[in-house]
């Protein structure tokens, strides 16, 4: 159904990282505008991005209300300048998005190594606990607050003089690893949610190496 001079949106795609969630679609509008609606499986539809000429809509504010819910969105197409116009069935043209469950599907953002400190033959590496847009009691929650022990970090570490990457894992934001005395090491971390079947890994953090500003060395 729909008017003859509007086309339905297509390629509806969720783009979500650390719960910042945008719905994208095609085509770029020609003589038409879009409105987006979002709902949980059991909830009412809520309209967002009214009569927009954009082909994306930020739905973060809606999905952060309950990141474990499954959401569905739909994009309505209206003739530009005549948004009251409806199709032959008395309803504007629309297309449904795939279902989206933020907790299971949001991409893990690139982590950052906050600091590393060497004490003798041990190095403590700390990963920054990134803030998300999920709120509880008017406070923004960190990634660790949201995922708890479901979130682990994998540390890759290697001697500056070699290429083989050793690994360590933690379900906190800290690693304590053994290193060889007198050797400089480089570090990179990856966030992982092992219980997922897709989107399990983040991209790697920027590499940080000993002998650079971020670290601290203490000989004991």
């Amino acid at each position: 159904s729909g008017t003859t001079n509007t086309v339905a949106a297509y390629n509806l795609t969720w783009k979500s990282t650390n719960f910042k969630t945008i719905l994208e679609w095609e085509p770029k509008p020609v003589n038409q505008v879009y409105t987006v609606q979002i709902s949980t499986k059991s909830g009412d539809w809520k309209s967002k991005c009214f009569y927009t000429t954009d082909t994306e809509c930020d739905l973060t504010d809606e999905i952060v209300k309950d990141v474990k819910q499954t959401y569905l969105a739909r994009v309505f197409s209206y003739p530009a300048g005549n948004v009251e116009s409806t199709g032959s069935a008395g309803e504007p043209l629309y297309e449904n998005s795939p279902e989206f469950t933020p907790y299971l599907e949001t991409n893990l953002g690139q982590p950052t190594i906050q600091s590393f400190e060497q004490v003798g033959t041990k190095v403590n590496v700390t990963v920054e606990d990134e803030r998300t847009l999920v709120r509880r009691n008017n406070t923004f929650l960190s990634l660790r607050d949201v995922f708890g022990k479901d979130l682990i970090y994998t540390l890759y570490y290697w001697k500056s003089s070699s290429s083989g990457k050793k690994t360590a894992k933690t379900n906190t934001n800290e690693f304590l690893i053994d290193v060889d005395k007198g050797e400089n090491y480089c570090f990179s971390v990856q966030a992982v949610i092992p219980s997922r079947t897709v989107n399990r890994k983040s991209t790697d953090s920027p590499v940080e190496c000993m002998g650079q500003e971020k670290g601290e060395f203490r000989e004991i």
């Epitope: 682990i152 290429s163 050793k166 894992k169 092992p194 997922r196 897709v198 399990r200 890994k201």
Partner: antibody, heavy 120, light 107 residues
Framework: EVQLVESGGGLVQPGGSLRLSCAAS????????IHWVRQAPGKGLEWVGY????????YYADSVRGRFTISADTSKNTAYLQMNSLRAEDTAVYYC?????????????WGQGTLVTVSS | DIQMTQSPSSLSASVGDRVTITCRAS??????VAWYQQKPGKAPKLLIY???FLYSGVPSRFSGSRSGTDFTLTISSLQPEDFATYYC?????????FGQGTKVEIK
């Protein structure tokens, strides 16, 4: 269903090369880690090395470092073990295996193995 | 590298027996120890992970425990299909290392 299928084994002369393949199905290799483990005839299990197909990071056992190279083609969902400068002591069944990647579970699925014989 | 010393290297037992296999780590590995079962000509199968957790589909007669750096695999009542070789493995640090294996044979 998760499956790992190795291929490429066979008879090779000392000093020769061989490339083993590990074709994965039922999961995406870039979401996990892939290990190679070998077992000489009548002997125990020996870890060879791993790859994180997502970023290409690898690490090898001392016994094979500099001779063996692990790689992955995520578009084919396949990992590889390139073995150069082969020695008689490399004769073994070679298994590829999936690392679940959690703190608790390590290797949860293994391939059926492929036999590599190094002999003149 | 961390050494995993497994004992005994072999044992003979009868159906219904309680069987215990031990692995000692050369240094602290926390609970990052798995146990695998391997039958001749077959790939290993995961039995126990994180020292004491039973992997999905594994019979409850298998159990694992930890005491410091000592890890134990127990089969409470040996069944005919349990005659196989068992390996422990630590994955606390890279490289991961296996025990030498314990062959459980029919008495």
């Amino acid at each position: 269903e998760v499956q790992l299928v190795e291929s490429g084994g066979g008879l090779v002369q000392p000093g020769g090369s061989l490339r083993l393949s590990c074709a994965a199905s039922g999961f995406t290799i870039s979401d996990y880690w892939i290990h190679w483990v070998r077992q000489a005839p009548g002997k125990g299990l020996e870890w060879v090395g791993y790859i994180d197909p997502y970023n290409g990071y690898t690490y090898y056992a001392d016994s094979v470092r500099g001779r063996f190279t692990i790689s992955a083609d995520t578009s084919k969902n396949t990992a590889y073990l390139q073995m150069n400068s082969l020695r008689a002591e490399d004769t073994a069944v070679y298994y590829c295996a999936r690392d679940y990647g959690s703190l608790q579970v390590f290797i949860d699925y293994w391939g059926q193995g492929t036999l590599v014989t190094v002999s003149s | 590298d961390i050494q995993m010393t497994q004992s005994p290297s072999s044992l003979s037992a009868s159906v219904g027996d309680r069987v215990t296999i031990t692995c000692r780590a050369s240094q602290d590995v926390n609970t990052a120890v798995a146990w695998y079962q391997q039958k001749p000509g077959k790939a290993p199968k995961l039995l126990i992970y994180s020292a004491s957790f039973l992997y999905s589909g594994v019979p409850s007669r298998f159990s694992g425990s930890r005491s410091g750096t000592d890890f134990t695999l127990t089969i409470s009542s040996l069944q005919p299909e349990d005659f196989a070789t068992y390996y422990c493995q630590q994955h606390y640090t890279t490289p991961p290392t296996f025990g030498q294996g314990t062959k459980v044979e029919i008495k």
